[in-house]
Amino acid sequence: PLATIPVSTTSLTSSEGSTISTPSVDISTPVTTSIVGDQCSRCKNGGFWDGLKCQCLTPYYGESCEEVVNSIDIAPPETVSAQMELTVTVTSVKFTDELKNHSSQEFREFNKTFTEQMNIVYSGIPEYVGVNITNLRLGSVVVEHDVLLRTKYTPEYKTALDNATEVVKQKITKVTTEQIMTNDNCSALMCFNTTGTQVQNITVTQYDPVEECRQKAEEYEDYFLVEYRDQKPYCISPCESGFNASKNCNHGKCQMSQNGARCLCVTTETHWYSGEDCNQGTQKSHHHHHH
């Protein structure tokens, strides 16, 4: 069952013996009550009681899953890839029915020669992984194949793969224009029909750290953002320190609520702190204002 708990003012004692005042807010927090056996525990925000403690769902933590984490793990893939579907026409080999059978000696030999030829063609492309023949058909031999590209994930991976696909197009166009039959004979490893070269389709890995961050932040999606460090994306709230978007709470503690990040100001033995960033100090004895 869901219960509605009003959030009231609480005082937290800081490490220096000071207290943190949390003002009353007009939002209500839904509470899920999970019951396992005789043990009844209020695990909030979709968390569940495992018999010992609350198991919290992202982005929550704490004894009752009532607090919001400052950062969420997002894991971009180690590598990203692109697959290009190409067709070339090989004229230096005549088509036979055995080429349709991928376990035949004919297909294996053709595959070996074609792979060798393409490895030479694409040798200067660092993203090039290899080729995979998907189909062979009559005319002399029409080779439907995939060119596989891969690169390390960086924020600019799409540009890197897009550039690589362009170089693939240039190189295959060049080789199929230059390596052609003369007098019904081929002096190259393979010869081609220039007009038979086509790029059918290009598929690039889709990974968006911002989207993953927003999804994992759930109802806090508007307040979590992605920042990069050493080309690695971090999904952070403004309460996470050390980033451009970090909120400076000065004499206070940053806390996430459903309205965003806010500062909970400290009250020490000598001062009250207030203001949005807890940067306004009032001396208790003289009621003197500091900015």
Partner: nanobody, 123 residues
Framework: DVQLVESGGGLVQPGGSLRLSCAAS????????MSWFRQAPGKEREGVAI???????GYADSVKGRFTISQDNAKNSLYLQMNSLRAEDTAVYYC?????????????????WGQGTMVTVSS
């Protein structure tokens, strides 16, 4: 495993003739292609002649009209009849085979090779 064994090489005078033979271990190439290549000392291996299962034959320009390639599928054998031999024909002659119906005189396009037989044309 496929094996190719050449024979028929030797010493011959300029203008003379020789017939090279290549015996294949089985008839797997009867539906593909067979060829002769040669390699002169200090030079790259070059294509001499091809014969394919569809009846097509191809020759290097340097041997056209002088050399003839033929095949006997019943005997799993390939032949090269060499007439009007010249000093520049001196080389090790290799038999090569492919399961593919090839039109390529590039040695890299061929996957199966014999050990070679030496042909020396000298007076």
């Amino acid at each position: 495993d496929v094996q190719l064994v050449e024979s028929g090489g030797g010493l011959v005078q300029p203008g003379g003739s020789l017939r090279l033979s290549c015996a294949a271990s089985d008839n797997t190439f009867s539906r593909g292609s067979m060829s002769w290549f040669r390699q002169a000392p200090g030079k790259e291996r070059e294509g001499v002649a091809i014969i394919s299962s569809d009846g097509w034959t191809g020759y290097a320009d340097s041997v056209k009209g002088r050399f003839t390639i033929s095949q006997d599928n019943a005997k799993n054998s390939l032949y090269l009849q060499m007439n009007s031999l010249r000093a520049e024909d001196t080389a090790v002659y290799y038999c090569a085979a492919s399961f593919l119906v090839l039109r390529a005189l590039n040695p890299k396009a061929w996957h199966y090779w014999g050990q070679g037989t030496m042909v020396t044309v000298s007076s």
